[in-house]
Interface confidence: low
């Protein structure tokens, strides 16, 4: 299985301190992971790589983004990326991406969170994505 | 075979210009990459992608880590991650992710070093991690 | 197939906006995949996982590299790395790492470009590189 | 400026249960661990174990699994460690203590201390 | 678990002079040790960390030093501020443990 999301917009619910993605799928082989919302469902337990990249237009002193999973009653921060951005508008410009492999159970909800309120995303799709490759 | 490695801690020897992670297997398949301390042996010859991400929190003006292997008597780069950081504290907060993909051989032993003495690095797993997957 | 590029050298056209960096294979694995001067020719149709890295030394407000393919009578951004960078020459130094997963279509030309005129890359092999697997 | 602000000192009966908070401010909460540390009268100190804010995830001392809960709410930045069946073993000052995961890898702030006595 | 010992329990001074508090731990920590600074009613405060860093605002006539399993704290021109009790932290592994503390007292 493969699944190549990208976004379909970004959210801070109200009093909420992070900025969720809601995404859809680009590329799609097989059916072990299906796109929820803000989450990315795994119905085929295995190892996966996952990558996840965010383009950021914000002078907040760092960004970045937490790709987490939630299931078996738990919620565990697989990897994390971070940058630290200028303070000047113009020059606030980053794109931050990281991958790695992990073991993935069924009916885990995989989710990309920006921990903070109203971050400034550049939501095209080849800023930012988000991806899962079954090995 | 798959390695995602966490550190355990990272030293710089005394009189050293360098940092070295000590790595512990978070996921494991197959049993073609054994975990020494600071360095991975090789264990299967063939293809890999390697992946490295490192968390900084340094006002050195770069900060970075090389990726490399010992192995036939020579030591070879294999890949670099290199990052600017801000001199404000506060700011000096950066992830630094590489990846590629590498011919190793039997008996390599693959390392992660921050050419900096005592580098100030994050050591939580989703910040700072390894990988291997045989292709 | 496998493809692990690096690069042979770096031009800007005269009056061209963006700089083009020469590729030669590092490793090569099955002959779906052709280096050609500044692409690279997709022999093997298919789902590729994709990864770029530019090794940047300038002080140009934010550099960063545009991953796109030509074919079938049109250019597509597959995806792109965006790095903000210090005003000073010393700390100026910053790799840009970027991947994601994409279906190929067999003659497909695949390029790295940097939206900026004579940009100035460090082209170590361990800095700046592009690869390709096929899955 | 970074300050951790503790709750004040607390007298409970035996076999009562109490609830220290701990309220971050001066630095992004999720961020960074909180741990709690206990210090017993005129000795040494004893690592409780951490919360990671982010995600909620502990890690207890084996020591105080089943004596000690952590946890968070990450609305008001605030760190609570939950103290059940006291007995006065439990009298001591509890410190929250935040990690800084990344340029230290240790306790760099530190919260002002909670006295919990505990006695009929 | 690690044992941080710190066989010292009382050392005594004077103002000016130089003391050396000493902490073995019982299995290899690297150099993942901190000290910590505590005066009667108030929170420990962090001297040093990976052994040989000092914090931020800390005087430099505080030294760590060490690696391994035996570890250091030095400090030079003792002034009267220093007197108050002083612990060493190992973060090498879970659980985190503490030396006893060893206090530091005029002559």
């Known amino acids: 299985s493969v699944l190549h999301l990208v976004p379909i917009n970004a959210t801070s619910k109200d009093d909420s301190d992070v900025t969720e993605v809601m995404w859809q799928p680009a590329l799609r082989r097989g059916r072990g992971l299906q796109a929820q919302g803000y989450g990315v469902r795994i119905q085929d337990a295995g190892v996966y790589l996952l990558y996840s990249q965010v383009l950021f237009q914000d002078v907040t002193f760092t960004m970045g983004q937490v790709v987490s999973r939630e299931g078996q009653g738990r919620q565990e921060t697989l990897f994390r990326c971070i940058r630290s951005m200028p303070s000047h508008p113009d020059r606030a410009y980053n794109s931050c991406y990281s991958a790695g492999v992990f073991h993935l159970h069924q009916g885990d909800i995989l989710s990309v969170i920006i921990p903070r309120a109203r971050a400034k995303l550049n939501l095209s799709p080849h800023g930012t994505f988000l991806g899962f490759v079954k090995l | 075979s798959v390695l995602h490695l966490v550190p355990i801690n990272a030293t710089s020897k005394d009189d050293s210009d360098v940092t070295e992670v000590m790595w512990q297997p978070a996921l494991r398949r197959g049993r073609g990459l054994q975990a020494q301390g600071y360095g991975v042996r090789i264990q299967d010859a063939g293809v890999y992608l390697l992946y490295s991400q490192v968390l900084f929190q340094d006002v050195t003006f770069t900060m970075g880590q090389v990726v490399s292997r010992e192995g036939q008597g020579r030591q070879e780069t294999l890949f670099r991650c290199i990052r600017s950081m801000p001199s404000h504290p506060d700011r000096a907060y950066n992830s630094c992710y590489s990846a590629g993909v590498f011919h190793l051989h039997q008996g390599d032993i693959l390392s992660v070093i921050i050419p900096r003495a005592r580098a100030k690095l994050n050591l939580s797993p989703h910040g700072t991690f390894l990988g291997f997957v045989k292709l | 197939s496998v493809l692990h590029l690096v690069p042979i050298n770096a031009t800007s056209k005269d009056d061209s906006d963006v700089t083009e960096v020469m590729w030669q294979p590092a490793l090569r694995r099955g002959r779906g995949l052709q280096a050609q001067g500044y692409g690279v020719r997709i022999q093997d149709a298919g789902v590729y996982l994709l990864y770029s890295q530019v090794l940047f030394q300038d002080v140009t407000f934010t550099m960063g590299q545009v991953v796109s393919r030509e074919g079938q009578g049109r250019q597509e951004t597959l995806f792109r790395c965006i790095r903000s960078m210090p005003s000073h020459p010393d700390r100026a130094y910053n790799s840009c790492y970027s991947a994601g997963v994409f279906h190929l279509h067999q003659g497909d030309i695949l390029s790295v470009i940097i939206p900026r005129a004579r940009a100035k890359l460090n082209l170590s092999p361990h800095g700046t590189f592009l690869g390709f697997v096929k899955l | 400026e970074i300050q951790l602000q503790q709750s004040g000192p607390e007298l409970v009966k035996p076999g009562a249960s109490v609830k220290v908070s701990c309220k971050a401010s001066?630095?992004?909460?999720?961020?960074?661990?909180m741990y709690w540390v206990k210090q017993s009268h005129g000795k040494s100190l004893e690592w409780i174990g951490y919360?990671?804010?982010?995600?909620?995830?502990?890690g207890y001392n084996q020591k105080f699994k089943g004596k000690a809960t952590l946890t968070v709410d990450k609305s008001s930045s605030t760190a609570f460690l939950h103290l059940n069946s006291l007995t006065s073993e439990d009298s001591a000052v509890y410190y929250c203590?935040?990690?800084?995961?990344?340029?230290?890898?240790?306790?760099?702030?530190w919260g002002q201390g909670t006295s919990v006595t505990v006695s009929s | 678990d690690i044992v941080m010992t710190q066989s010292q329990k009382f050392m005594s001074t004077s103002v000016g002079d130089r003391v050396s508090i000493t902490c073995k731990a019982s299995?290899?920590?690297?150099?993942?040790v901190s000290w910590y600074q505590q005066k009667p009613g108030k929170s420990p405060k962090p001297l040093i960390y990976?052994?040989?860093n000092r914090f931020t605002g800390v005087p430099d006539r505080f030294t760590g030093s060490g690696s391994g399993t035996d570890f250091t704290l030095t400090i030079n021109n003792v002034q009267s501020e220093d007197l108050a009790d002083y612990f060493c932290?190992?973060?090498?592994?879970?659980?985190?443990?503490f030396g006893a503390g060893t206090k530091l007292e005029l002559k």
């Open positions: 932290e190992q973060y090498s592994s879970y659980p985190l443990t």
């Open positions: 001066g630095y992004s909460f999720t961020d960074d661990n």
């Open positions: 990976w052994a040989s």
């Open positions: 203590a935040r990690r800084d995961n990344y340029a230290t890898g240790t306790m760099d702030y």
């Open positions: 299995k290899n920590v690297g150099t993942d």
């Open positions: 919360i990671d804010p982010l995600n909620g995830g502990t």
